[in-house]
Structures are given as C-alpha cells and as structure tokens.
C-alpha cells in the first residue's frame, strides 16, 4: 500500500535568480485532485493554497511581489490528495540578485583564444564578499564557484570550441544573495587550423534576456516548465 504520493515539481518563473524588488512566482505542480499545496521555506511552512476545483487543477503558484534577501533561500513544496501527503519536492534555491555592487569580469589571455589555450576568468569585487560565481549564458548549467578576498580565479584549462559563449560573474554575500551581474564577456574560441573544426556555439540568448534565460538539469532540455525541477539543484551545493 502506497504511503506517500509522488513528489511534486517546483520551479521559479521567470527565473530562480531574482533582482531585488522584482517579482517572482514559485510554481508547484503535483497531481489533479490535490486538495492542498504547502510551500515550505527553509524547512518551515510558508504558504498554503487549496485549488478549486481540485480535480481540474494540478499546479499552484505562490507569488512574491517584492524580492528581498529575507525571501531568498531554499523552498520546497508538498501536496495532499485526501489524507495522503506527497513526498517533498526537490529544493529550489531562490537567489536575490542586484545586491550592493557590481563585479568586474576579465579573461586571460583575452576574449579571443585558440582551441587548446589555457584560459582563466577573474571576477573582482572590492566589497565584503569572499565567494564568486561564474555563469555561462545559454541553455546549459555552466556554473562555477570560486573564492578569494576581493577576486576569484576561474581556470577553464585548455579550452575547446564548446567553451565559446557569453560569461558573467556575481559576488555572493551568502548562498542566496548575489551582487549585480558583471558586464558580459564573450569568449571566442577559434579552432586550431590544423586539427580542430569549429563546433556550433552553445545556444545563447540575447544579453537583454539575461534575467530570464533558463538553466536546465539532468532531465535535459525540457519544454514543459514542470520538468525544470532540478534547475538550481546543483548550483549551490
């Protein structure tokens, strides 16, 4: 006899990285017939929704109109059908960005390199932070974490054409409070003429959609938002 229902999917729209004072919606998708959904924040009950009519609704939304550092953290949700509760969803890391200052991102030896060259990114922020994050724009979860007093070094090692793309970095004041994003740095990797062919660039989004592009997960490139379950799962661990 089944003691719990399958866990629901949780995700943030438009993105799990939310600029301060901007709005975000946390979505929780369970099953049709669920009479109650609970959103938990940092392990405590945060909000409850009871969809009507439950048999026609399998998703609820929890709206946060004004993002701030107090709302940033780990969220999960559960739902109930009759007296039976589901397993909790995976954790959603909701991050507040545009806090305090803007880091500077630079790349050595330069933004244009040959396949096989060693490349190092530097993210610098003079205010009190010791953790930095380097993100590559696009549909793949390219996130690196680095540490340093005012600057972190991100060695990419010998690059390939797969490293081509646009990078930004953040200073992190804690796991869920990040600085403004740096100006973008576009890395152009040219194939070594003798033995490397040019590979297609990782799909990227225009710079003005930086705040809304989606990171995928081990589930692959899913179009259905309900399957973007593990979006931030591995980001901060």
């Amino acid at each position: 006899q089944q003691q719990t229902l399958p866990k629901p999917f949780i995700w943030a729209e438009p993105h799990f990285m939310v600029p301060k004072e901007k709005q975000v919606t946390i979505c929780c998708q369970g099953n049709y017939g669920a009479v109650e959904y609970q959103l938990h924040f940092e392990g405590s009950l945060f909000a409850v929704d009871r969809p009507k009519p439950p048999e026609r609704i399998n998703k609820v939304q929890f709206y946060i109109p004004d993002m701030n550092s107090r709302m940033a953290g780990q969220y999960s949700c559960i739902y109930r059908v009759g007296e039976l509760w589901s397993e909790p969803s995976n954790l959603l890391d909701l991050v507040v960005t545009e806090m305090y200052d803007t880091p500077t991102l630079s790349v050595h030896p330069g933004p244009e390199v040959i396949s096989g060259e060693k490349v190092t990114f530097y993210c610098r922020l003079d205010t009190a932070t010791s953790m930095f994050l380097l993100l590559k724009e696009g549909r793949s979860s390219h996130v690196q974490r680095g540490y340093g007093k005012v600057q972190a070094e991100f060695p990419l090692g010998p690059v390939t054409t797969a490293h081509r793309g646009t990078y930004r970095c953040f200073g992190s004041y804690n796991n869920h409070a990040w600085s403004f994003p740096s100006e973008p740095v576009k890395l152009l990797v040219t194939g070594d003429i003798e033995n490397t062919s040019l590979a297609p660039e990782d799909p990227t989004f225009p710079a003005d959609t930086w705040g809304t592009y989606l990171l995928t997960t081990e589930t692959g490139l899913q179009k259905d938002h309900a399957l973007w379950d593990h979006t931030a799962q591995n980001l901060l661990r």
Epitope: H108, P109, I114, G116, E117, K118, T120, E153, P155, P158, D192
Partner: nanobody, 118 residues
C-alpha cells in the same frame, strides 16, 4: 628576478621586414605562454601574437595575421617576432611578456620602438 629584454627595433620602410628578439634571464621551457604586445602613440597596449609552450599553439591579432610570425627557442630562452610587409600602422613600441602558469602576464620587458616610415 626574471628579466625580459627586447631588441631588433628600429626604423624601416613600408613593405620591408624586421625581426624582434626577446631574451629572458630565466629558463623559459617550463613557461606556459609568451607573447608580443604593442602600444602605438596615444593608444592602449594590444596583443600582437602569443605562443603557448608545450603545445606550440600560436595566436595572432587579426591585423597582423599572415604578416607576422611568432616563435620561441627554449634552448636560447628567446622569443622572436618576424614581421614582414610592414605598414605605417605597425609603428609602435613592442613589448615582450611572459605568462609562466597560464593565469596572468607575470613579466614584461621595457619595449623596443618600431617605426615604419618612408
């Protein structure tokens, strides 16, 4: 303390060739990358060419591609820049630089002036 000393600069006519050398006081075979930069009057310093150590990967700025050739002789601890088909816009102070680990340009030379003029 490592020292880089450039030589070979001078005045040359457009279309002619020149070879710059950069002698290093330390052993260069273990250095990851060496490069040539230049700075024209009133402009910023820009990369001209660089060469990676063991892989011998060479990068050239678009403006010099096909005209300049970078090479290094680790047995002599020397970096070279062969410049041909020189143009007036190649006039600049040329600097040699060394990157021992692949992370930053650790050492710089004092520069040698190249003037391309008829």
């Amino acid at each position: 303390q490592v020292q880089l000393v450039e030589s070979g600069g001078g005045v040359v006519q457009p279309g002619r060739s020149l070879r710059l050398s950069c002698a290093a006081s330390g052993r260069t075979e273990s250095w990851y990358r060496m490069g040539w930069f230049r700075q024209a009057p009133g402009k910023g310093r820009e990369v001209v060419a660089r060469i990676s150590g063991d892989t011998n990967i060479k990068y050239y700025a678009g403006s010099v591609k096909g005209r300049f050739t970078i090479s290094r002789d680790n047995s002599k601890n020397t970096l070279y820049l062969q410049m041909s088909s020189l143009r007036a816009e190649d006039t600049a102070v040329y600097y040699c630089a060394a990157d021992r680990t692949g992370a930053t340009w650790d050492y710089w030379g004092q520069g040698t002036l190249v003037t391309v003029s008829s």
